[in-house]
Interface confidence: medium
């Protein structure tokens, strides 16, 4: 497990002529903010194929506004770095991707807006724990610095992050329950301090402060063996190897939740369910009452005047758990109306409209025939989320407002003198020729040179076109 | 405890106008978007606008447009919509009713206590 | 506009009863579907959201079911306090919009 870490440097207008000043230009205040995107491997996967190593999004930088008569700066950037988690090996080769997001700020319909504005992808070898890698890129017209490296989370180490190392202070033999495994490394730099008292035998820590139990121990302190554990039978005469493996510790083991919370798994972590009165990562924090603040996301606390009395906590819809602190997996409400795609970018949620729609969850139907009436007779026609008019005869443009002149196009041949009409229009032939467009020659014995059976004229039709 | 408080409402000549508010406390104002429904005698509820949590989008019924103007000021945690043109079917009660907070579900979760609208000659 | 109609505008049910109130939208509005109710003293509060989540604070005998253009809201053990109008609205396309209304009354 470990950490891959992105610092961008500047973000700007690239060098040469045709770079643009602003990434605002005259659309008033924006803001920029990055997501990363990492894949594993080095193979040219589809811009759409998911980030399978992880991805992060960066808070939103400082408003900006473009000044008319000064010189293209470098962009006001978010602050802080962009950080992906990874539970597995750390591969080595990676394809990065960098977007540059704009949001536009100025008053307009459907609030504020987001686009790419530059996107950079390349594919790198980059071993953990090594120095900070230096980038510079192009987007288009846009240049991008940046920096970028990968680090182990204790006790992984190594290139890859697959080799345990073990705290100073772990025993070097293997305690019961614990099966043989590859020698560890002989110790961590900076190890963790457990909590106080953990036992140094049968206990564990990966962060300060805990105190996590090995296979076949249980208690606060790791101090009270279990009496029947699964594990102890895998101990045999290698046993004493120096290396051990809590074989498959879950980070459940020993329950970490204090005050009673229950635990459970999730993807290299834990989660605690605190009872009502507790909450922080480990319901470690007690005797809260509705004056602590203790609902987040803007859930109301119900009782809980005192410590002796629980509280509770109405979340807004969205939000879940005692305290209001679980985010419901927006997305998968499907919050993009008419067909829109969702993107939860963590801060917030976006969604991207199809032509036709606007609006923060594209509920506002720009193409809707209610209210927009077509002028001059036309009827409004709906269909796939647009409309159309269909203008009475004479008539055309948008809505129908303008008057078409059936003649502009001269369609009369040979001369053919044209008349607007209310169904369309009526060629007037010049002597000699005939047809709905004066289009045929007369002979002088008096035959027409028609075929004989013309397509939807036959002699004697009056000459005008439908 | 969340709390919405109209207040603005009278009796007006049709033509004229009237500037309702909305005072709003118990919760981060600036984190919501905020909904204007209103209520005619013996009638059911109609939508009348609705502006987001940072005042940048904003949308009215077809019914009010070009005559009712939404805003708000989050120093204050107020909401306002400044009526102008008011015509008879104008009247009615008018509550402020709080947006969700994503804007997922375009819910109105916590409602006013309304303030009246009447417009007469 | 996406019309909205509850086709039953009064009810009158037994306490203790099961009461199902219905709505129907003029085309799909893909479960963002919310339910209130008024009380007779004019106080609306907001019941089921997204067709069929519980707001907080709602009693548990309150549920809400449907998809498409067909939804309904089931009142399981009919009480005194539920004496009121409901309402149905839609949150898919603007504008939002309210179905007419159900008043419900005891028998």
């Known amino acids: 497990a470990g950490v891959f870490e992105l610092q961008i440097h500047s973000f700007g207008p690239g060098p040469g002529p045709g770079a643009p000043r602003s990434p605002c230009s005259a659309r008033g205040p924006c803001r920029l903010f990055f997501r990363v995107c990492l894949k594993p491997g080095l193979s040219e996967e589809a811009a759409e194929s998911p980030c399978a190593l992880g991805a992060a999004l960066s808070a939103r930088g400082p408003v900006y506004t473009e000044q008319p008569e000064a010189p293209a700066p470098d962009l006001p950037l978010p602050n802080g770095l962009l950080q992906v988690p990874f539970r597995d090996a750390w591969p080595g080769t990676f394809s990065l991707i960098i977007e540059t997001w704009r949001e536009e700020l100025g008053d307009q319909i459907g609030g504020p807006a987001w686009s790419l504005l530059a996107r950079v992808t390349r594919r790198r070898r980059l071993a953990a724990g090594g120095p900070w890698a230096r980038d510079i890129q192009r987007a288009g017209a846009w240049e991008l610095r940046f920096s970028y490296r990968a680090r182990c989370e204790l006790p992984a180490v190594g290139t890859a992050c697959t080799r345990l190392c073990r705290p100073r202070s772990a025993p070097s033999r293997c305690g019961p329950g614990l099966r043989p495994c590859a020698p560890l490394e002989d110790e961590c730099e900076a190890p963790p301090v457990c909590r106080a008292g953990c036992s140094l035998e049968h206990g564990f820590c990966e962060q300060p402060g805990e105190c996590r139990c090995l296979e076949g121990w249980t208690g606060p302190l790791c101090m009270v063996p279990v009496s029947t554990s699964s594990c102890l039978g895998l101990r045999g005469p290698s046993s004493t190897t120096t290396g051990c493996l809590v074989p498959g510790p879950g980070p459940c083991d020993g329950n970490p939740c204090a005050n009673g919370g229950s635990c459970s798994e999730t993807p290299g972590s834990f989660e605690c369910t605190c009872p009502r009165g507790f909450y922080g990562l480990r319901c470690e924090v007690s005797g809260v009452t509705c004056a602590d603040g203790p609902c987040f996301n803007g859930g109301l606390c119900v009782g809980g005047a005192d410590p002796d009395s629980a509280y509770i906590c109405h979340c807004p819809p969205g939000f879940q758990g005692s305290n209001c602190e679980k985010r419901v997996d927006r997305c998968s409400l499907q919050p993009c109306r008419n067909g829109g795609l969702c993107l939860d970018l963590g801060h917030a949620l976006r969604c991207r409209c199809r032509a036709g729609f606007a609006g923060p969850r594209c509920e506002h139907d720009l193409d809707d025939c209610a209210g927009r009436a077509c002028a001059n007779g036309g009827t409004c026609v709906e269909g796939g989320g647009a409309h159309r008019c269909s203008c009475a005869l004479g008539f055309g443009g948008r809505n129908c407002r303008e008057r078409a002149d059936p003649c502009a196009a001269r369609p009369c041949a040979h001369g053919g003198r044209c008349y607007a009409h209310f169904s369309g229009l009526v060629c007037a032939c010049a002597p000699g020729y005939m047809g709905a467009r004066c289009e045929f020659p007369v002979h002088p014995d008096g035959v027409s040179a028609l075929p004989a059976a013309p397509p939807g004229l036959r002699p004697g039709d009056p000459q005008r076109y439908l | 405890e969340v709390q919405l408080v109209e207040s603005g409402g009278g009796l007006v000549k049709p033509g004229g106008s009237l500037k309702l508010s909305c005072a709003a406390s118990?919760?981060?104002?600036?984190?919501?978007?905020i909904h204007w429904v209103r209520q005619a005698p013996e009638k059911g509820l109609e939508w009348v606008a609705y502006?987001?949590?940072?005042?940048?989008?904003?949308y009215y019924a077809d019914t009010v447009k070009g005559r009712f103007t939404i805003s708000r000021d989050n120093a204050k945690n107020t909401l306002f919509l400044q009526m102008t043109s008011l015509r008879s079917e104008d009247t009615a009660m008018y509550y402020c009713?709080?947006?969700?907070?994503?804007?997922?579900?375009?819910?109105?979760?916590?409602w006013g206590q309304g303030t009246s609208v009447t417009v007469s000659s | 506009d996406i019309q909205m109609t509850q086709t039953t505008s009064s009810l009158s049910a037994s306490l203790g009863d099961r009461v199902t109130i219905s709505c129907r939208a003029s085309?799909?509005?893909?479960?963002?579907l919310n339910w209130y109710q008024q009380k007779p003293d004019g106080t609306v509060k907001l019941l089921i959201y997204?067709?069929?989540r519980l707001h907080s604070g709602v009693p548990s005998r309150f549920s809400g079911s449907g998809s498409g253009t067909d939804y309904s809201l089931t009142i399981s053990n009919l009480d005194q306090e539920d004496i009121a109008t409901y309402f149905c609205?839609?949150?898919?396309?603007?504008?939002?919009?309210f179905g007419g209304g159900t008043k419900l009354d005891i028998k």
């Open positions: 502006i987001s949590s940072g005042g940048y989008t904003i």
């Open positions: 085309r799909d509005i893909t479960k963002f």
């Open positions: 997204y067709t069929s």
């Open positions: 118990g919760f981060t104002f600036s984190d919501y978007g």
């Open positions: 009713a709080r947006g969700d907070y994503d804007d997922i579900f375009y819910t109105m979760d916590y």
């Open positions: 609205q839609q949150g898919n396309t603007l504008p939002w919009t």
